[in-house]
Every structure is written in C-alpha cells, then in structure tokens.
Interface confidence: low
C-alpha cells in the first residue's frame, strides 16, 4: 500500500521537511502532489511526468517545493501556514489511480522567555506572588523550575493559565528561588533567565552569643546579638531593663560583680514592623564552676600509614564549654589532613601519616575553668609487603 512519511513530522519554522513515499508502484505514468486531504486541481502543488522527467508547478506552488523522481516532495523554509495534510496521487500504467495522504506540523522556534512578577518584595507568611511566563504562544508547553528543580508538590504552589502562571501562596523566606520558566514545543525549548524574590521576614527570636553565663571580675564582657531578618534587623541593648545602646554588639571592659544581671537584646525590622527580644543572665563571680574531665576515644588506636583514617572524639557532659586539641604539646589542627567537626568534638585525620603517631589529648574550658582528658596513644604502622601486582604505590 502506498504511504507517505514526513521527515520530520514536527518541523521548525524556517527549516525543511521531506514528504517521503513508501511502496511506490513500479509501472507509472506520473504523479501529483496536492495541499489538503484530497485531490483538488486548484490546490495542486506540482505534477511530474515520468516519461519526460518533467515537473510542472501547480496553483498551490510557492517556489519552495522540489519533487524527486521517487515521488518524494521537499518543502524548504517552511512557515506555520504549511502545517497540515498533503496528498499524493499516483497515475499507474493500468490507469488505476492510487492516493496517499500525509501531514506535518510546523512550530515556531521559540524565543527566550521572561518572567514577570506582580510582587518582587513580598512579606513572609502574608503576601502571595504570581509569576507569569512571557510570551504567550500557541502549541507551547510551559514548565517551571525552582532552584533548578521541577516544581515540588505543595499546596502553596498553584499553576494556572495553562501552566503559564505560577502562584506562590503565603511566601516564606525559603521561597527566594531562583525561578525559571521553560517553554517547549516539539521542535525547540528555551529557558528564561532566573528571577529571585526578595522576601521580607523577621526578625526571628534573637540569639545572644557567646553562650557563657559565668564571668570572672576583671574580664571583658563582649556580647553579640543576631536575629534572622530581611532587611537586617536593628538592635538595641537593655541591662536590667534600662536602655544602653543601639548596636548589634555590647562591650563592657573590666567587669565587676555589679555587672551581673539581665541583658536584653531587642531586634526590630522596620519593614515588617515586628520586634523580638531575648534575655540573657550574666553572673560575674569569683567562684569557679568546675569543668568535668572530658573523655577521649579513638575509632582505632593502631592504623596503617598513608591508607587508614582515624577519628578522635572528645566527650563531655558540661554545657557552655569550648574544646581544643593537643598533640605533642602543640594545638591542632596542624595540617591539611586534620579536620575538626561537630563543634570541635571530633578530630579527623585522613590519611594518617608516620608523623601523626604519638599522644593526643583534648581540653574543655569555659571563661572560668578548664580540664584535660587523659592522653591517648596513636600508633602508625606501615605495610612492608609489596602490592600483589608487583607495582610500587603511586
């Protein structure tokens, strides 16, 4: 049976399409191509006489068509108006005509889209934001990406307008993006430049650092306050309810027992109009809250050099303390291979080398007292045997 196949079926505007013919009968006088689903002399594109190998343009010929001896039709520089059906009529030598209809679809090469927004500076937990992907084009699929990932399933995310509009209900500070929209049709795809949201939020409850409560007389008291906020919060300090200063940091040199009391940090966001406070008790005393002796443990105490790694862990039940590490009376880390993690509670050495053998201990301390662990010995061995394949390492 006579058939046609469009190559490709979906064509980009300005490109070319080949209407291929399959199962063309052997004994032929000629054939004609028509625009549409039926034979219509008014819509003939071209006729071809086999005997003379002569092609004759028809009324629907645009000058962009080329017919080949195998009956295939090439259409160049296609436009969206070329979309549709094409019918081939074959006149056989037995005068029985055969017909076959094919089709293709022309799609535009899509432009780079852009994102418009109804609110670029929303307030957290209050405002909604609607993004719209421009331009609006026919036969186009609209996709959205947040942080380079397809949209997560969330009741706060709504698609509308044929997926061209993305609405964020009740934005949060984590909704900054970036947001991208992608437009697709069967022949092209294009993604917008990223757009980010400036979400106004906060302040959250402030945190006063350091966490220490106890200080010795004569020490310097340096407190810092931080509250997550956009735009950044404005800070002020009160001591025992009395305003002191409008700064993020409070510094009092050479403190005395009279500086004991309640220290309040006040954080304000002028855009959201919200305020948050945190109170911290400071005790200035000669008495020493004793820090307990920490415990030190090793993932292994005998390791193979240049191969193994080891983790040393310093454990303490005390709070508000800091930890530091020592090796052969030197503070650590002392090389790129040594890493501290989990608030300095873990010392990792990767890989272990010969010079890492020896005694390690940790020390916990607060502004008032400190205590050391018992030492632990790390042994480093080296394999004397050659590798199985006989090749030297490295």
């Amino acid at each position: 049976q006579l058939t046609t196949e469009s190559m490709p079926f979906n064509v980009a505007e300005g490109k070319e399409v080949l209407l291929l013919v399959h199962n063309l009968p052997q004994q032929l006088f000629g054939y004609s191509w028509y625009k549409g689903e039926r034979v219509d002399g008014n819509r003939q594109i071209v006729g071809y006489a086999i005997g003379t190998q002569q092609a004759t343009p028809g009324p629907a010929n645009s000058g962009r068509e080329t017919i080949y001896p195998n009956a295939s039709l090439l259409i160049q520089n296609v436009t969206q108006n070329d979309t549709g059906f094409y019918t081939l009529q074959v006149i056989k030598s037995d005068l029985v005509n055969e017909e076959a209809t094919g089709q293709f679809h022309v799609y535009p090469e899509l432009p780079k889209p852009s994102i418009s927004s109804n609110n670029s500076n929303p307030v957290e937990d209050k405002d909604a934001v609607a993004f719209t992907c421009e331009p609006e084009t026919q036969d186009t699929t609209y996709l959205w990406w947040i942080n380079n990932q397809s949209l997560p399933v969330s009741p706060r995310l709504q698609l509308s307008n044929g997926n061209r509009t993305l609405t964020l209900l009740s934005v949060t500070r984590n909704d900054t993006g970036p947001y991208e929209c992608e437009i697709q049709n069967p022949v092209s795809a294009n993604r917008s430049d990223p757009v980010t949201l400036n979400v106004t939020y906060g302040p959250d409850t402030p945190t006063i650092s350091p966490s220490d409560t106890y200080y010795r007389p004569g020490a310097n008291l340096s407190l810092s306050c931080y509250a997550a906020s956009n735009p950044p919060a404005q800070y002020s300090w009160l001591i025992n309810g009395t305003f002191q200063q409008s700064t993020q940091e409070l510094f009092i040199p050479n403190i005395t027992v009279n500086n004991s009391g309640s220290y309040t940090c006040h954080a304000n966001n002028s855009v959201t109009g919200c305020n948050r406070t945190t109170v911290k008790t400071i005790i200035v005393t000669e008495l020493s809250p004793v820090v307990a002796k920490p415990q030190i443990k090793a993932s292994k105490t005998t390791v193979t050099g240049d191969k193994d790694s080891v983790n040393l862990t310093c454990s303490t039940n005390d709070t508000g303390i800091s930890i530091r590490w020592f090796f052969k009376n030197q503070s650590l880390p002392s090389s790129e291979r040594m890493k501290l993690s989990q608030g300095n509670t873990t010392l990792s050495i990767n890989p272990v080398k010969r010079e890492d053998a020896g005694t390690y201990w940790c020390e916990v301390f607060n502004p008032i007292s400190k205590n050391q662990s018992d030492p632990i010995m790390l042994n480093v061995n080296y394999n004397a045997l050659p590798q199985e394949n006989g090749l030297s390492p490295g």
Partner: antibody, heavy 121, light 110 residues
Framework: EVQLLESGGGLVQPGGSLRLSCAAS????????MSWVRQAPGKGLEWVSV????????YYADSVKGRLTISRDNSKNTLYLQMNSLRAEDTAVYYC??????????????WGQGTLVTVSS | QSVLTQPPSASGTPGQRVTISCSGS????????VSWYQQLPGTAPKLLIY???RRPSGVPDRFSGSKSGTSASLAISGLRSEDEADYYC???????????FGGGTKLTVL
C-alpha cells in the same frame, strides 16, 4: 505490560552474518523510536543504532557504520538488526531499547533481556 | 575510551549519600539532556533519571540527578545494599550524531 524480546543471537565466525530481531508488545510500537545497545562481556554499554518511529531517520555509531543495518516492521511490531562482516569486537549482549521521547530528549525507558552474539573462529 | 567520563568505582555505607559524576562536552551534556541507568548484576539496564533530573514512576526519590554546564551527577541518598550495581550516564552527541554512554561506575555498598 511493555515487553521487548530479542532473538537471533548465537555463535558466528568472523566475516559472517547474523540477523537479530526484537519483538515488541504492550505498547503502540509505531509511535516509538527504537535503538540497539550492546555490552561486551565485562564492559560498559555502547549505543549501536537508532531508527525513528516511522523508519525515516536512522543513525549509527561509527564503529558499526557500513556493516550493521537497523530496520523495523511496524505491522509486525518488530525491530531488526542485520549484522554483516562481523568481527571479534562485535561480541556482546545486544539489547533493544525504547525511546519514549521521539528523540526530543533521547533516553531508553524499557530494555529487552538481551541476546548474546559471539564472533569467534 | 568513553565520550562521557565517569569514575570507575564508588562506595558508601548503608544510609550514606553517594554522588557519581559524569563529565562531557558542549556537544553532548552541554546541549542535550542526560539520562542515568542502573544495571544490577546479570540484568538489563534500568532507567533511573531522564531529562537531567526527572525520575520515571517507580524509581525511589532517593535517586536524584542534576546538571551544570558540561557535567552531570547522580546522587543516591539513604544508601541500601540493593543499590550495589553499575551506573551509567548517557546523552545524545551532536558531533557524533549518536547516543553516548559513560564508561560506568561500579557502586559498592560496604
């Protein structure tokens, strides 16, 4: 349920020929581009050839051009690979695989169980 | 020598997160979508990720894909013993007019 079943593998001498078939079921075969992918023993995957859903577009890996020919019969829901002038390096398990994207984002979502072709004297 | 470059091996312990990289060029990863396949011993490959980061239905969300420039990565979180397999990346190559695979990465669950 989508199924792809390869057949036609076996032992063949260097220079010989073989024709592999892949019978498809559980989906509209004529709507999908199809590929052959091979895997030499103990080695990685190597794409061999692809044919469009209508059979009009065909591509081959450089290593098989002129020796292997892909074809399809949509009426029989079958994909073929004609293998000529076979070499020892053609020894592999041959998988047929379906591309659900019509080539817009080429990928293979269903694979057959594979058929082993051994080229040896 | 594969057109796409993967590390030959990777390992992790159960529950861990492991990432496998795939490096290519502008003619493949840079301008085409990337897929990831899992091949368990003695079985046919299985599609894990297509179009850079999309998961077919039935693939656990422990598997995720990403792409940046001419490189792509497969991340497996909450590693399980049944994840021990060979993993391949793949993409269409505009210069070769063909599909290319990475050399494969053997993942061992310790």
């Amino acid at each position: 349920e989508v199924q792809l079943l390869e057949s036609g593998g076996g032992l063949v001498q260097p220079g010989g020929s073989l024709r592999l078939s892949c019978a498809a079921s559980g989906f509209t075969f004529s709507n999908y581009a199809m590929s052959w992918v091979r895997q030499a023993p103990g080695k990685g995957l190597e794409w061999v050839s692809v044919i469009s859903h209508g059979g009009g577009s065909i591509y081959y890996a450089d290593s098989v051009k002129g020796r292997l020919t892909i074809s399809r019969d949509n009426s029989k829901n079958t994909l073929y690979l004609q293998m000529n002038s076979l070499r020892a390096e053609d020894t592999a398990v041959y998988y047929c695989a379906r591309d659900p994207t019509k080539g817009y984002a080429p990928t293979f979502d269903y694979w057959g169980q594979g058929t082993l072709v051994t080229v040896s004297s | 020598q594969s057109v796409l470059t993967q590390p030959p091996s990777a390992s992790g312990t159960p529950g861990q997160r492991v990432t496998i990289s795939c490096s290519g060029s502008s003619s493949n990863i840079g301008n085409n979508y990337v897929s990831w396949y899992q091949q368990l011993p003695g079985t046919a490959p299985k599609l894990l990720i297509y179009a850079d980061s999309r998961r077919p239905s039935g693939v656990p969300d422990r598997f995720s894909g990403s792409k940046s420039g001419t490189s792509a990565s497969l991340a497996i979180s909450g590693l399980r013993s049944e994840d021990e397999a060979d993993y391949y990346c793949g993409a269409w190559d505009l210069s070769l007019n063909g599909y290319v695979f990475g050399g494969g990465t053997k993942l061992t669950v310790l």
